[in-house]
Structures are given as C-alpha cells and as structure tokens.
Amino acid sequence: RDKVMSEFNNNFRQQMENYPKNNHTASILDRMQADFKCCGAANYTDWEKIPSMSKNRVPDSCCINVTVGCGINFNEKAIHKEGCVEKIGGWLRKNVL
C-alpha cells in the first residue's frame, strides 16, 4: 500500500512538471484536481515550483469556482488548498487498496 502511494506521489509530481507542455497530461490533472477538489501534490504551493508555470498562478482546476483565468493571480481563499496525493490517496485506500 505504501509503495503504491509513493509511486502515485512521484507520478503525480512528474505529471505536474509536464502540465504546461502536454495538453493530455494537463487535462488528466485538471480532471483529478476538479473532481477531488484538491490542488498540487502536497498542496497548492507545489505549482510555484514548476519552472514553466508563472509564479502567481495555479491551474484553473484548483479554483473552488472554476472559471477561465481564475487561477491567475490567485487568492488562497478562492482555491482548494488540500493536496491531491493525500486526498486521492485517501480515496484509493478506502475504495481500491
């Protein structure tokens, strides 16, 4: 179980690196973030560490109310602050693992 979670964490972070470069990856991550109401791997600040992402933005899928451009110059109160690895991991533990 721990190995699966560790793999999921590494994979999620790898996909984050590809987010700005790959539309397919972006759409998968957007779906996960929107569906699980989460943002980033550990939390939303992970997006700040992606070199090709603008420092003041997160994907729009992180927003509580998703609209085009809502992740630009974001306010913390307007986005999901919980990380996706923990949130999706909890769902996986409960339903799959």
């Epitope: 420092k55 003041n56 630009i72 306010n75 913390e76």
Partner: antibody
Framework: QVQLVESGGGLVKPGGSLRLSCAAS????????MNWIRQAPGKGLEWVSY????????YYADSVKGRFTISRDNAKASLYLQMSSLKAEDTAVYYC????????????WGQGTTVTVSS | DIQMTQSPSSLSASVGDRVTITCRAS??????LNWYQQKPGKAPKLLIY???SLQSGVPSRFSGSGSGTDFTLTISSLQPEDFATYYC??????????FGQGTRLEIK
C-alpha cells in the same frame, strides 16, 4: 471602517536595521494577500514584497532580496517588514497595501511611514 | 518581467477638458490592469480594476479600456480635484508587481 496603519519608520544609518509594522482593522485580514510598496522622494511607486493569506507564499523585489523579510501575524491582523543592511536608496515612504488578488486592484492603502537612510 | 510604459509623463489640461492617459505593457496582460490616482502627500487610491471596472465610490467621469498590451484611462470632464499623478499597474504576471512611471496631470 477598513484601515491600515503603518508604524516603525524613522532615520537610520546605512547598514542599519528597522522593522515596519502595519495594523489592519475593519476587514477579515486572512482573506487578503498583503504588500509593501514604497515611493522614493519625487519618484514613482515600487513594489517591495508580498505575502499570501496564510504566509505560505512570499516574494521580494530584486532590489531588497536577502535584506528584507516580510511576515504576518494573522491572530493580530498585523503585517511586518524587517529591513536590514539598509542603503541610501531604501529611503522612501513605505505603504502597507491590501490585495484581493485575481483581477482586482490593490484596494486599501495605509497612510505610509517614512524611512530615511542617511549618515 | 513585464514593463509598463505610460504616456504622456506629464500633461496640462483645464477644468472641463477630456483627458486620456495611455499605458502599454511589454507583453500581453489580458485585462489584468489597474489604475491609481495619487495626490501630493497622500497614498494612492484605486480608480479602475480589470482594465475597465470602476472601483466603488469613484466618479463615473473616470473610465478605462483596453486589453492585451494597450490600455487607456479617460477622464471625461476634468474637475479641480482630478489634478494628481496617475499610475497603471499590472497583476497578470507577478512577481514582480509592476507600475507605470506615472503621469502627472497639471492645471493649464
């Protein structure tokens, strides 16, 4: 009413330190990013630093990086700017500024506090 | 970093005149453009946000337009209290938050 009140400015020698404070009232402090913006005598506005709602994200202008530290105490609804290794070019009025972020502008400014760096 | 360039840097006008100040961004900033007014010895005051939205309490003679790289602030009929310095500011790509150099509006 919504208010930001700065304090802590004064005259300091080059190389010295100073700590600016900003007391917020009349609004939910944790709903906002906060900025320090300065204005040198007779000059335009220059952004210095910002800090996110929770304090998780903070950034600095290149001109102050490594010398200034921004922080906030949400329990006290207060913003701070610790300034060290001060230079003559840091002489300015320093404004504490509320920032709703997204596409909204910086909507509430303090009255400013004057920092003079001179020997 | 995104540079903001205002023109003119100073402007003389009379009460009742229609005045336009322009601001140009070095790259597209969508509509993430704000305008501020500053009077001598006072803190700046937000006039316009999101390029064209009037901040609460600001008189309707002030208006903003533009998107992408080119923006304008228009004062339809100058009043004595409008003589001040005006700044544009972008919030599309930060840090850093960048301002124009300012436009000083003086009485002719």
């Amino acid at each position: 009413q919504v208010q930001l009140v700065e304090s802590g400015g004064g005259l300091v020698k080059p190389g010295g330190s100073l700590r600016l404070s900003c007391a917020a009232s009349g609004f939910i402090f944790t709903d906002y990013f906060m900025n320090w913006i300065r204005q040198a005598p007779g000059k335009g506005l220059e952004w210095v630093s910002y800090i996110s709602n929770s304090g998780n994200i903070l950034y600095y202008a290149d001109s102050v990086k490594g010398r200034f530290t921004i922080s906030r105490d949400n329990a006290k609804a207060s913003l701070y700017l610790q300034m060290s290794s001060l230079k003559a070019e840091d002489t300015a009025v320093y404004y504490c500024v509320r920032d709703p972020r997204m596409f909204y502008g910086m909507d509430v400014w303090g009255q400013g506090t004057t920092v003079t760096v001179s020997s | 970093d995104i540079q903001m360039t205002q023109s003119p840097s100073s402007l003389s006008a009379s009460v009742g005149d229609r005045v336009t100040i322009t601001c140009r961004a070095s790259q597209s900033i969508s509509s993430y453009l704000n305008w501020y007014q500053q009077k001598p010895g006072k803190a700046p005051k937000l006039l316009i946000y999101a390029a064209s939205s009037l901040q609460s309490g600001v008189p309707s003679r002030f208006s903003g337009s533009g998107s992408g790289t080119d923006f304008t602030l228009t004062i339809s009929s100058l009043q004595p209290e409008d003589f001040a310095t005006y700044y544009c500011q972008q919030s599309y790509s930060t840090p850093p938050i960048t301002f124009g150099q300012g436009t000083r509006l003086e009485i002719k």
